[in-house]
């Protein structure tokens, strides 16, 4: 039961953190005008990855796309590039997710099998979580820089009459939204591994038994099911102990009361 | 077709309050950002109020800060502006006028006039 | 607050004739986020109220007669009458619409001969 909620809820979780980052991804305020010198403001400027926006206050606003790739700073590409890898990751640890749930029956499909995929949906969410808060963390250090950089200038070269007005950016909504989203993919992505521990056909614990056979002693060791060798394929492996362990036959013949059809 | 028709002004006297409206027509007042401008007798043009679309924002010039209150009744769609503690340096035409385009006014209506006077 | 500043204050021409005013603003009226200059040129015949001719420095409105061209960035801007009429007699106004106070400058008054 706990291993089906873990389970749900990773992917719950890392639902929303995509969802999240394609959100942040396509918003168009990673930075915005700084206000603090000036708060009444009537002209209102805004970027994104994809387009700047400049909102006027007679509620006009206009967005202009960036219709150039080599034009643009290598930074803004890198962050472009990371958003959009996160989004694919996640995009694919979902589809991956979904047949992995364990309330989800496809088939005869296997635990290990549930168990390989909630492990790679998991490491996938992970890695798109670090995609976007990367990305994100890469855009605000640049903000921060640029940001510390434009100050500078605003104090230099005032001596003559005339003043230019130095537009500074700071954080925007997406960037928030951003680190919140990878966030919670990567704390999605974490559960799923964690579930996957649950989910695997764990080793199932045998007393060590001595068989006597034809004057040779063989030592059984525990988890030697598995791999069944030495077994005619008639033989039933019989419960040496009643401890909760099922023989293979009874794992296969009953199902849990977890799984929903 | 846009209308804009300023009523309310009159002869006050120094101190006095006064309350100007704007009656809208030909579009939905809520959906613009409206101001109001003045015109002193010496000809100056000086912006005095504006009130940003869905009213949450209204701006002021520090001449008339804490004196004069900008505000819109959608229902009515009219403007209004409350002048208050009115000195003889308020004396002007008084015109409402809604914003386009790049903050220009595109559209005033034809201004009511307002004498602060002993 | 961005002071706003005229020439000349009147100018009296001849019909036909190019006319130029020039309006200096204190402060830098471009935006960088649009690349667009924030500055708005009007026209006030008199008893009228008055009448909106160009913003974005070079953007004509509406309306307005192609003879009218404004241009100019950054701090220096001039509105252009290319060949001035008769129905021109007016005052000329700019107005800074890039930072609150939004302020105005003293007016060109175009007379005609």
């Known amino acids: 039961m706990a291993v089906t909620a873990c389970q749900g809820l990773g992917f719950v979780v890392s639902l929303i953190g995509i969802a999240g980052i394609i959100a942040a991804t396509c918003m168009d305020q990673w930075s915005t005008q700084d206000l603090y010198n000036n708060p009444v403001t009537a002209v209102f400027n805004y970027q994104g990855l994809w387009r700047s926006c400049v909102r006027e206050s007679s509620g006009f606003t206009e967005c202009r796309g960036y219709f150039t790739l080599l034009g643009l700073p290598a930074m803004l590409q890198a962050v472009r590039a990371l958003m959009i890898v996160g989004i694919v990751l996640g995009a694919i640890g979902l589809l991956v997710s979904i047949f992995a749930l364990k309330c989800i029956r496809i088939g005869s499909m296997e635990d290990s099998a549930k168990a390989n995929m909630t492990l790679t949906s998991g490491i996938m969410f992970i890695v798109s979580g670090l995609c976007a808060i990367a990305g994100v963390s890469v855009f605000a250090n640049m903000l921060v820089t640029n940001f510390w950089m434009s100050t500078a200038n605003m104090y230099t070269g005032m001596g003559g009459m005339v003043q230019t007005v130095q537009t500074r950016y700071t954080f925007g909504a997406a960037l928030f939204v951003g680190w919140v989203a990878g966030g919670l993919t990567l704390i999605g992505g974490v559960m799923m591994c964690i579930a996957c521990r649950g989910l695997a056909p764990e080793e199932t614990n045998y007393k060590a038994v001595s068989y006597h056979a034809s004057g040779h002693s063989v030592a059984y060791k525990p988890g030697g099911f598995k791999a069944s060798t030495g077994f005619g394929s008639n033989t039933k492996n019989k419960k040496i102990y009643d401890g909760g362990a099922r023989t293979e036959d009874e794992v296969q013949s009953y199902p849990s009361k977890h799984d929903y059809v | 077709e846009v209308m804009l028709v300023e009523s309310g002004g009159g002869i006050v006297k120094p101190g006095g309050s006064l309350k100007l409206s704007c009656a809208a027509s030909?579009?939905?007042?809520?959906?613009?950002?409206m101001s109001w401008v003045r015109q002193t007798p010496e000809r100056r043009l000086e912006w005095v109020a504006t009130i940003i679309i869905g009213g949450s924002y209204t701006y002021y010039p520090d001449s008339v800060k804490g004196r004069f209150t900008i505000s819109r009744d959608n229902a009515k769609n009219t403007l209004y502006l409350q002048m208050s503690s009115l000195r003889s340096e308020d004396t002007a035409m008084y015109y409402c006028a809604r914003q386009g385009y790049g903050n220009s006014f595109p559209y005033w209506g034809q201004g009511t006039l307002v004498t602060v006077s002993a | 607050d961005i002071v706003m500043t005229q020439s000349p204050s009147s100018l009296t021409v001849t019909a036909g004739e190019k006319v130029t005013m020039s309006c200096k603003s204190s402060q830098s009226l471009l935006n960088s986020g649009n690349q667009k200059n924030y500055l708005t040129w009007y026209q006030q015949k008199p008893g009228q109220p008055p009448k909106l001719l160009i913003y974005w420095a070079s953007t004509r409105e509406s309306g307005v007669p192609d003879r009218f061209t404004g241009s100019g960035s950054g701090t220096d801007f001039t509105l252009t009458i290319s060949s001035v009429q008769a129905e021109d007699l007016a005052v000329y106004y700019c107005?800074?619409?890039?930072?609150?106070?939004?302020?105005f400058g003293s007016g060109t008054k175009l007379e005609i001969k």
């Open positions: 107005q800074n619409d890039y930072s609150y106070p939004f302020t």
């Open positions: 030909g579009f939905t007042l809520s959906s613009y950002t």
